[in-house]
C-alpha cells in the first residue's frame, strides 16, 4: 500500500513545515486514494481485457454509479460551493457500497483495496467537517445497499470483471472532478 497521507518523504525533510490546512489535508487524502485506484486498475487491466473495452459498451452496464453533472454546482460555470460539497459527500457515501464490493475482487492488491475503502471513509469525515448544511446530505439506505451487494456478487465472472473495472474508472473520475471543484472553495 502507498504511504498513508499526512507526511510524505518531502515533508519529513522539512521539520519546520507548517501543519497541513484542512484543504491541503483533503487534497492529499484524495490523491492518496487516486494512487490506490491506479494500483487496483493496474491489476484489473493485467488480469482482463476490460480496460480496452469501449466506453459505449461500458455505458450499457446498468450500474447506477454517482456522476457529476452541471446542476451539481461543481463545474467552473455555475459553481456553488455548498451545493457542490453536498454532491461530493453524497456521491462518496453512494460509492461506499461499490468499494465494499471491491474488497474480494483482488488477489495481489487486497491491502490496497482495503486502504482505498478506509481512506474514503476518512475523506468523508474531513468533508463533513467542512460542510455547513449536513441535513442536505442523504445517506444511502443500508437495506438497499445490502441487496445491491448481493446482486453484484451473484453476477457471472465476466460481468464481475466489468463491474470492477467500471467502479474503479467511475470512482477515479468522480474523485478527479472533486479535486478540481474543492480547489475553488
Amino acid at each position: 500500500a502507498p504511504v498513508p497521507p499526512g507526511e510524505d518523504s518531502k515533508d519529513v525533510a522539512a521539520p519546520h513545515r507548517q501543519p497541513l490546512t484542512s484543504s491541503e489535508r483533503i487534497d492529499k487524502q484524495i490523491r492518496y486514494i487516486l494512487d490506490g485506484i491506479s494500483a487496483l486498475r493496474k491489476e484489473t487491466c493485467n488480469k482482463s481485457n476490460m480496460c480496452e473495452s469501449s466506453k459505449e459498451a461500458l455505458a450499457e452496464n446498468n450500474l447506477n454509479l454517482p456522476k457529476m453533472a452541471e446542476k451539481d454546482g461543481c463545474f467552473q460555470s455555475g459553481f456553488n460551493e455548498e451545493t457542490c460539497l453536498v454532491k461530493i459527500i453524497t456521491g462518496l457515501l453512494e460509492f461506499e457500497v461499490y468499494l465494499e464490493y471491491l474488497q474480494n475482487r483482488f488477489e495481489s492488491s487486497e491491502e490496497q483495496a482495503r486502504a482505498v475503502q478506509m481512506s474514503t471513509k476518512v475523506l468523508i469525515q474531513f468533508l463533513q467537517k467542512k460542510a455547513k448544511n449536513l441535513d442536505a446530505i442523504t445517506t444511502p439506505d443500508p437495506t438497499t445497499n445490502a441487496s445491491l451487494l448481493t446482486k453484484l456478487q451473484a453476477q457471472n465472472q465476466w460481468l464481475q470483471d466489468m463491474t470492477t473495472h467500471l467502479i474503479l474508472r467511475s470512482f477515479k473520475e468522480f474523485l478527479q472532478s472533486s479535486l478540481r471543484a474543492l480547489r475553488q472553495m
Epitope: 492529499k28 490523491r31 453533472a69 472532478s177 478540481r180
Partner: antibody, heavy 120, light 106 residues
Framework: EVQLVESGGGLVQPGGSLRLSCAAS????????MIWVRQAPGKGLEWVSD????????YYADSVKGRFTMSRDISKNTVYLQMNSLRAEDTAVYYC?????????????WGRGTLVTVSS | DIQMTQSPSTLSASVGDRVTITCRAS??????LAWYQQKPGKAPKVLIY???TLESGVPSRFSGSGSGTEFTLTISSLQPDDFATYYC????????FGQGTKLEIK
Amino acid sequence: EVQLVESGGGLVQPGGSLRLSCAASGFTISSNYMIWVRQAPGKGLEWVSDLYYYAGDTYYADSVKGRFTMSRDISKNTVYLQMNSLRAEDTAVYYCARWADDHPPWIDLWGRGTLVTVSS
Amino acid sequence: DIQMTQSPSTLSASVGDRVTITCRASQGISSWLAWYQQKPGKAPKVLIYKASTLESGVPSRFSGSGSGTEFTLTISSLQPDDFATYYCQQSWLGGSFGQGTKLEIK
C-alpha cells in the same frame, strides 16, 4: 500515430469570431483531458482553457472567460475552441494539447499550432 | 487565476555552466508543476513533471525541485542544445505558465 492537428486559424477583424478545431488521432478524446494554450508573437505561453473528459467540465483563463468556449465532438474525435468578440491581444499561435492522465497532470502531447491574427 | 512568476527572464551562460531557473506560485500548488523547453518555431516539450520527475528520454543533467510555492529547474552542465526558452506551468487549478526564461549563449 498519436497526434493532434489544429485548423481554423486565420485573419479576423476585431469583434469577429473564429472556431478552431483540433483533430486527435491515435487516442480517444472521450477519455482524455484536453487543453488549449496560446502564444502571442515573440511572447510566452498562456493557458487558455481545458476540458476534462468527465462530463465535459471546462475551465477558462480570466482573459478569455465569457468570450471563448471549448467543446468536443466525441464522434469526430475533435476538440473545438469557439472564439467570439476577438481582440487584437488574442493574436497568437493556438496550440491544442493533451494533459497526461495523472495527478498531477502535465502536457504530454502538443499539436503544431494554428495562427490567429486579429487585425483591421 | 494562479500567477506564476519565473526568474530570471533572460540568462546568459556558457557551455558547461550550471544554471538554475526559479518559479514562484502565487498560492501553494503542492508538486503540481511541470517544466517545458521550447525552441523557436516549435511546440514546447516537457522536461520535468510532478515538480521533480524527469520525463523519459530527457538527459539527467536536467533536474527539478521544490514544493508549495517555490520551484527550481537546474541544468547541471549546459550543452549547446540547451539554449532555448524554459517555462514552468502549474496544473493545480487551470494551467497558467510562468513568463519564460530565455537561456542564451554568453
